[in-house]
Amino acid sequence: EVEKTACPSGKKAREIDESLIFYKKWELEACVDAALLATQMDRVNAIPFTYEQLDVLKHKLDELYPQGYPESVIQHLGYLFLKMSPEDIRKWNVTSLETLKALLEVNKGHEMSPQVATLIDRFVKGRGQLDKDTLDTLTAFYPGYLCSLSPEELSSVPPSSIWAVRPQDLDTCDPRQLDVLYPKARLAFQNMNGSEYFVKIQSFLGGAPTEDLKALSQQNVSMDLATFMKLRTDAVLPLTVAEVQKLLGPHVEGLKAEERHRPVRDWILRQRQDDLDTLGLGLQGGIPNGYLVLDLSMQEALS
């Protein structure tokens, strides 16, 4: 708390300007009118105030707006934003994307702080969904943002927002998150032609079902092994040798190096050795010739 003392004669601030950097903390408290500060917040950023002086300015705004700052003030907080606590931010109602961008810019280059995380949560909750512009902004500043959302939260992302997602934004997502994002991506990119579609959908394929992989195998996509290794094992298992060969194209030779790893290992175990031999890669572990394969899951479904 700053002690309440009268402002010395002639020191009353008429505007927020450079002269204030020479004021002691108690003088700032006594001589700067909070309402003046609120209307001239945009000037604060250009003035090299000390951290202690910024504390005083924040205190003045807190007194003026005990229920939370209005957006007109929030948008111009600049470096004063770094002084805010998550508790302060929870009182705000931020609706403008410009305000969000301005405050994210202040924190740019640093890890996401609790203040920024709270701000983003408040903003997204206020909007009701992660629209394209918001997602575009958030992933531009924080590429991993998407992968910190729960599958339920991701389900509120409209397909149109998927256009804002870059491959690196999905790097840390887990399979359940991709299960939610994939159908949205499929919908978002449905009107693109074959090769363009594959480029866009590739990062999301960790959530693709078997039937979609079968469809892709008919389109000469030449999927690389890194993408293939991220596919759902249960989606890969029903694919035939011919379908995998078409899906991978020239990359099919890479299967040999991955034959002990999932999903390749499990897929090999489900294929007839005869069929695997047609690839000429020396893949071993398939079902020997003459063996009958019973699909028990099918049997259960029928009974």
Epitope: P86, P114, I120, Y142, S148, L149, E152
Partner: nanobody
Framework: QLQLVESGGGLVQPGGSHRLSCAVS????????MRWYRQAPGKEREWLTS???????AYADSVKDRFTISLDNAKNMLYLQMNSLKPEDTAVYYC?????????WGQGTQVTVAS
Amino acid sequence: QLQLVESGGGLVQPGGSHRLSCAVSVSTFTRYAMRWYRQAPGKEREWLTSIYSDGSSAYADSVKDRFTISLDNAKNMLYLQMNSLKPEDTAVYYCNANVDSKAYWGQGTQVTVAS
């Protein structure tokens, strides 16, 4: 810089239960996905389960109904309760945190299931 430290690894009997812990060095984050992965010798790292900041969780089919993820926010601890353990559960177990949009990994703890 957030740090993750796993503990609780060791030798477990087949059919037995075991709990792994992961200490999280900070607790001020508001948005997270905390996960457990494992890596068996000569195999790739495998995702097991996640818990998210809205309290929901998700599991890989291979561990569903046997493993349970939980988070004690007061103690800054992530847990993995493993039941009905099998020899094929032998691996190095890693905790992972996608916290406020950045990913972090622990150093791993070895779990061996054998009689």
